[in-house]
């Protein structure tokens, strides 16, 4: 498929222009070479117009031009002075006409409307309102005020002064007489229809002094906005619909065979299953504006996107709209990372996460995405040094491995971490991924003790046993903060017994802390990785406490406590809008709120790695 | 080559404080923990306190509590003990010890050449 | 506190000889299967050198004829065969417990 996109169909009138837009992957080799805008024959082939390199076909001469933008992967190609001969098959193209990439787009220039004089016209979104304005003289001002519609050769009735509504305009429209000082009646029309479009005539009186005025009516059906994304990458659909609809239920509708329009999201909390775990609407400011994200686009989720306002949460005819025709550009630059991660209840995960690699000094961000409502993602770690408060000791956010990718690891896991998560930055807003991470059957690969207590002033000693299929992976000790885990130096003390039907390549490694003081008190994790890239962690809570009596502290799985309890912890939630200090783009539109629900998680924890598109078990 | 380098002997007045300093070199600074030593002329040697430069954690002998404070310097990785109201009995020999903090297998493996404090008027 | 008792509180043994060294605390300083007890010898004007750690493991540069032994209370050094240069004074020190304690020392001479 040609990763070149443009307008499928422009649309225009005689003696207009129109500026088409055309995107392509802004690779070194896209942005220099030749882009072109030829028109297709009946026999094939497509003739050159107009091409960056200089070239004016004399069709176009004086009257067209071609710009280039390298920076933003676009090129627009502008063209004035339209008549009816310009209708037609068009390509814009990147390369030799004939090599396939290229975009087709049909152009339509029809004849302007033969008005009548002294017609005004009003020019109308689909959805909208419109005003139309009918003076009169003295003479009529007690006499009948109506307003027709010419279809064909007749006037049909649209409304009258009397009462009478053409059962077409039912419940939205008016007619308004002013007050005695002025000369006028209005007619409002509401939800505007693409057929309400044509000429009118409001007239007042019905005899031969009776005062006419002509209308024409143009609904435009909005063209829709192109916004070309990469595969794997989000789009923001920003919708302002005007504060007339400020309290009308708003949604997200992406059409499919026909007229159809399939909700993809709305306020009165329908969601596509397609887009579960990976769309956001955001709550709307107080002039009706709302905004949807999308992230982890599919091929699929190419299309015509509308956005409106209706009562019913889904498209109707009068339903105010925008529009956008959304490409999924499969020359993504976004990498392939897994798009699911398993891990087993007391175990941990290990979630690489991609971000743009011109961004190395960006803030990242991994959020829970919650569904309830219409979506939202409170943040649960940045790599500022903020950790939410029931995550602390079970997550951690490491740049490593660097160089386009960070990773998050989560430890001690239980059923509630089932969810979708995304991975983002306060750069580029395009790089939001999400990882769904899904608790299966099994037990945790890593064996440590559970509640450690150490004694002032003594040596702790903490094991961790790693089963045999770990035997070629990096084995680690660190303890955790909320900037990382600082690794620690452990000792490898032979093979473990604490597997069965496993040989000598099982390992036991110890942590060992001489001198324990109050400051050591905390989260550690034993794990694996394979040079910066992290594999499955275990969590122990050391707590430090004076010396009693005397006595031997051996800390073995055998005599290790059950998991920590569960505590329930202050929600330590921040609106997200609170890390946008530094850069106002940063979720401008994904306002999380206050999160009180999430508990402590005091369980231990197991991490995957595997395939692009799936995590599981622990090859790498 | 590891070294613990500690300042100058000090003649000093009672009731006034001083900080020994222990300069290291040769070694990963925040893997060990600093022990400092007093041995008084002729006595026994006794454990004052030990300082993990990785957190700052510290563990005093309760007879050395309120009279000194042990402190580290990272990015110098030197060690550092005040004494504070001294008097004729804080008199000695003052030595710091390293001590590998990650092995149950470790001890106080190498000492610095001691600082000589004298308290008189 | 756990309290170290040295014994002899000096000794005087013949070159060749074998010099034992005795240390007891007033409880266990075992722990994780190790004792926490380490000698030291000290020469005059010089700090301290480690010699034996864990009980029995001899530290670095430390010539074979320093050996340790003992678990629990009771330590012992043994220096076989005894040579001019190890004339000083050894203390034993237990590492299991703060405060760190060390024994009253042994002054060990050439007879």
């Known amino acids: 498929k040609s990763p070149i996109f443009g307008p499928e169909e422009v649309n225009s009138v005689e003696g207009n222009s129109v500026s088409i837009t055309c995107y392509y992957p802004p690779t070194s080799v896209n942005r220099h070479t030749r882009k072109y805008w030829c028109r297709q024959g009946a026999r094939g082939g497509c003739i050159t117009l107009i091409s960056s390199e200089g070239y004016v076909s004399s069709k176009y001469a004086g009257r067209a031009n071609l710009t280039n933008f390298p920076e933003n992967g676009t090129f627009v190609v502008n063209i004035a002075q339209l008549s009816q001969d310009d209708s037609g098959r068009y390509k814009c193209g990147l390369g030799i006409n004939s090599r396939g990439l290229s975009f087709d787009v049909s152009l339509e220039v029809s004849q302007g409307p033969g008005l009548l004089n002294d017609t005004k016209v009003y020019t109308v979104d689909l959805g909208r309102t419109v005003t139309i304005n009918c003076p009169f003289k003295t003479e009529n001002a007690q006499k009948r005020k109506s307003l027709y519609k010419q279809i064909g050769l007749y006037p049909v009735l649209v409304i009258d002064s009397s009462g009478y509504v053409n059962p077409n305009y039912t419940g939205r429209i008016r007619l308004d007489i002013q007050g005695t000082g002025q000369l006028l009646f209005s007619v409002v029309i509401n939800q505007l229809r693409l057929s309400d479009a044509g000429q009118y005539l409001c007239q007042a009186g019905d005899d031969s002094n009776s005062n006419k005025k002509n209308a024409d009516l143009q609904v435009l059906k909005p063209e829709p906005e192109l916004v070309y994304e990469d595969l794997r990458g989000s789009v923001t659909f920003h919708c302002a619909l005007g504060p007339e609809v400020a309290n009308v239920a708003k949604f997200l509708c992406r059409q499919s065979s026909g007229e159809n329009c399939d909700v993809v999201v709305n306020t009165l909390g329908k969601r596509a299953p397609a887009f579960e775990g990976r769309i956001l609407l955001n709550p709307q400011d107080k002039d009706g504006s709302f905004s949807v994200v999308i992230t982890g686009l599919r091929k699929e989720d190419a299309g015509r996107y509308l956005c409106g306002a209706h009562s019913d949460g889904q498209l109707q005819e009068g339903s105010p709209i925008q529009a956008w025709q959304l490409f999924v550009n499969e020359e993504s630059t976004i990498p392939r990372s897994p798009t699911v991660v398993k891990g087993v209840a007391g175990g941990s995960v290990a979630v690489l996460c991609p971000y743009n690699r011109k961004e190395s000094k960006s803030i990242k961000y991994w959020c829970l995405w919650e569904g309830a409502q219409n979506g939202r993602c409170p943040l649960l770690v940045d790599s500022e040094g903020w950790v939410k408060a029931q995550y602390e000791g079970r997550l951690s956010l490491l740049e490593e491995p660097g160089n386009g990718t960070f990773t998050v690891i989560l430890n001690q896991l239980t059923s509630r971490d089932a969810g979708f998560y995304w991975c983002l930055t306060n750069g580029d807003t395009l790089w939001r991924t999400t990882v769904e991470i899904k608790i299966i059957e099994g037990e945790p690969n890593l064996k440590v003790p559970g509640n450690v207590t150490a004694v002032l002033g003594e040596t702790l000693k903490v094991p961790c046993h790693f089963p045999c299929k770990f035997s070629s992976y990096e084995k680690y000790w660190c303890k955790w903060n909320n900037t990382g885990c600082q690794a620690l130096p452990s000792q490898d003390e032979g093979p473990s017994k604490a597997f069965v039907n496993c040989d000598e390549n099982s390992r036991l490694v110890s942590l060992t802390l001489n001198l324990v003081t109050r400051a050591d008190e905390g989260w550690y994790w034993c794990g694996v990785k394979q040079g910066h890239f992290y594999g499955e962690t275990a969590a122990v809570y050391v707590a430090v406490e004076e010396r009693k009596a005397a006595g031997s502290r051996d800390v073995s799985l055998a005599k290790a406590d059950a998991a920590p309890d569960e505590k329930v912890l202050d929600s330590g939630f921040r609106e997200i809008e609170n890390k946008a200090i530094q850069d106002p783009r940063l979720f401008a539109e994904e306002k999380a709120v206050a999160d009180t629900r999430d508990q402590a998680d005091g369980s231990r924890a197991s991490v995957d790695s595997g395939s692009s598109e799936e995590q599981g078990g622990s090859s790498r | 080559e590891v070294q613990l380098q500690q300042s100058g002997p000090d003649l000093v007045k009672p009731g006034a404080s001083v900080k020994i300093s222990c300069k290291t070199s040769?070694?990963?600074?925040?893997?060990?923990?600093m022990h400092w030593v007093k041995q008084s002329h002729g006595k026994s040697l006794e454990w004052i306190g030990g300082?993990?430069?990785?957190?700052?954690?510290?563990s005093y002998n309760q007879k050395f509590k309120g009279k000194a404070t042990l402190t580290v310097d990272k990015s110098s990785t030197t060690a550092y003990m005040e004494l504070r109201g001294l008097t004729s009995e804080d008199s000695a020999v003052y030595s710091c010890?390293?001590?590998?903090?990650?092995?149950?297998?470790?001890?106080?493996?190498?000492w610095g050449q001691g600082t000589t404090l004298t308290v008189s008027s | 506190d756990i309290v170290l008792t040295q014994s002899p509180a000096s000794l005087a043994v013949s070159l060749g000889q074998r010099a034992t060294i005795s240390c007891r605390a007033s409880e266990s300083v075992d722990n994780y299967a190790i004792s926490f007890m380490n000698w030291f010898q000290q020469k005059p004007g010089q700090p301290p050198k480690l010699l034996i750690y864990a009980a029995s493991n001899q530290g670095s540069g430390v010539p074979g004829r320093f050996s340790g032994s003992g678990s629990g209370t009771d330590f012992s050094l043994n220096i076989h065969p005894m040579e001019e240069d190890d004339t000083a004074m050894y203390f034993c020190q237990q590492s299991k417990a703060v405060p760190y304690t060390f024994g009253g020392g042994t002054k060990l001479e050439i007879k």
């Open positions: 040769g070694y990963t600074f925040i893997e060990y923990t």
């Open positions: 010890a390293r001590y590998y903090r990650y092995d149950v297998l470790s001890a106080m493996d190498y």
């Open positions: 300082i993990n430069p990785n957190n700052g954690g510290t």
